[in-house]
Amino acid sequence: EEELQMIQPEKLLLVTVGKTATLHCTVTSLLPVGPVLWFRGVGPGRELIYNQKEGHFPRVTTVSDLTKRNNMDFSIRISSITPADVGTYYCVKFRKGSPENVEFKSGPGTEMALGAKPSAPVVLGPAARTTPEHTVSFTCESHGFSPRDITLKWFKNGNELSDFQTNVDPTGQSVAYSIRSTARVVLDPWDVRSQVICEVAHVTLQGDPLRGTANLSEAIRVPPTLEVTQQPMRVGNQVNVTCQVRKFYPQSLQLTWSENGNVCQRETASTLTENKDGTYNWTSWFLVNISDQRDDVVLTCQVKHDGQLAVSKRLALEVTVHQKDQSSDATP
């Protein structure tokens, strides 16, 4: 015969108001003879929760049939949980005795606490866009959880981040808690399609963490590179000049052509293409009318990207009967 052990496997049981809580208790021996009772708390002031033999416990039911001869499961269910039910519950073996039963052994106890799930994490990025190689901050917030213990992790494209700071409030006892974490992320040029993920794990989530995401496309600005080229062939009195604006993000872009310092108002042909990394390329074609009598023509392609200072690129056309090699220089 094995020595009696009272097994209460859960140290902590998180329950929700209105739901049913199951408190587990099994014994390893049928001896000594006597009943198993449930109490909340310890000492003389402990509260009797269930006694199979006597009393009326309308909210309590047993998981097993306690009248079965070899029953070793004394687990109970308590229905319609309220905040008043929190506390530590003990299953206690008594020895049958005359005139009264005597307490023999107690289980280690199960603490029943009200559990509340954290809200879905909300991730907020920076107010303004930043260029690659710079650091931006993201914040993640989740509220309304209990108990206080919670785990928060940050990921960028599936890779865990380490540069973050987390606070759980309040520090003292409370019915519910909030978490706020700030992560610092260094932007890469290819981050247009990247994501940061804030992952929150809590005992109420049964191993299924909550995630909040933010797209780095909202935080990054990739400035364009410009190239102005002259097509080698001319068509009659016209030369085709191309301005290629490469690898920029976001799409917001204004392009203007200037001829010898004068802004050209006429329509120009253009195409927008998206790169695999999420950045864009913009190509604009400008037809310049040339004649033998004209002076040299300086063409300028000016680009204003996402409200930033304009950047421009110049191309000097040397107008002769036999078109000479093109040359170009840049202006900031």
Partner: antibody
Framework: QVQLVQSGAEVKKPGASVKVSCKAS????????FSWVRQAPGQGLEWMGW????????GYAQKFQGRVTMTRDTSTSTVYMELSSLRSEDTAVYYC???????????WGQGTLVTVSS | EIVMTQSPATLSVSPGERATLSCRAS??????LAWYQQKPGQAPRLLIY???TRATGIPARFSGSGSGTEFTLTISSLQSEDFAVYYC?????????FGQGTRLEIK
């Protein structure tokens, strides 16, 4: 091998108290309950009470209620039985016994003779 | 409390013969009964628990039976070392109680 070694014989005057010790070795002390059983000369066995070393819980036979106190020292794996207000009819051999499954006694001490005499 | 009554008070049996000792409980103790053997100047020794289960190291000639209120200890073929006093004990309810004992003597 489990062994229960009790303290030596005592001679006491009526009205005095006696404290008998029982040191356990060779088993997990806190896993088992210990009972005290006495046997008056030429008489049968009489259960006095029990104690759990792990919890400190005790239970005493009504006959000894108020006169007997059972304690333990887990650091030395020793249980004690103190009987107060001694009278001549308390003259007996006092045994400590290890309870198996909180029910029957699988190991016994060698016994301690307590003589109450004026 | 539950009163345990053993009979007979003394039993005289020849070595090699069978001895039957009885124990009666004043109310049902189910199968929660143990038997002990005690020799002069020694502590009791556990023989049987749960009415019929032999304790470690107890020879097969010792057997127990019964349930409820009537119990029997049988020694099938008495050996010289078996002559002693035998006690029954109930553990169905506190206080644990012993019978007054049966003295088994050589005939």
């Amino acid at each position: 091998q489990v062994q229960l070694v009790q303290s030596g014989a005592e001679v006491k005057k009526p009205g005095a108290s006696v404290k008998v010790s029982c040191k356990a070795s060779g088993g997990t002390f806190s896993n088992y309950g210990f009972s005290w059983v006495r046997q008056a000369p030429g008489q049968g066995l009489e259960w006095m009470g029990w104690m759990s070393p792990s919890s400190g819980n005790t239970g005493y036979a009504q006959k000894f209620q108020g006169r007997v106190t059972m304690t333990r020292d887990t650091s030395t794996s020793t249980v004690y039985m103190e009987l107060s207000s001694l009278r001549s009819e308390d003259t007996a051999v006092y045994y400590c016994a290890r309870e198996r499954s909180g029910s029957y006694f699988d190991y016994w001490g060698q016994g301690t003779l307590v003589t109450v005499s004026s | 409390e539950i009163v345990m009554t053993q009979s007979p008070a003394t039993l005289s049996v020849s070595p090699g013969e069978r001895a039957t000792l009885s124990c009666r409980a004043s109310q049902s103790v189910s199968s929660y009964l143990a038997w002990y053997q005690q020799k002069p100047g020694q502590a009791p020794r556990l023989l049987i628990y749960g009415t019929s289960t032999r304790a470690t190291g107890i020879p097969a000639r010792f057997s127990g039976s019964g349930s409820g209120t009537e119990f029997t200890l049988t020694i099938s073929s008495l050996q010289s070392e078996d002559f002693a006093v035998y006690y029954c004990q109930q553990y169905g309810s506190l206080p644990f109680t012993f019978g007054q004992g049966t003295r088994l003597e050589i005939k």
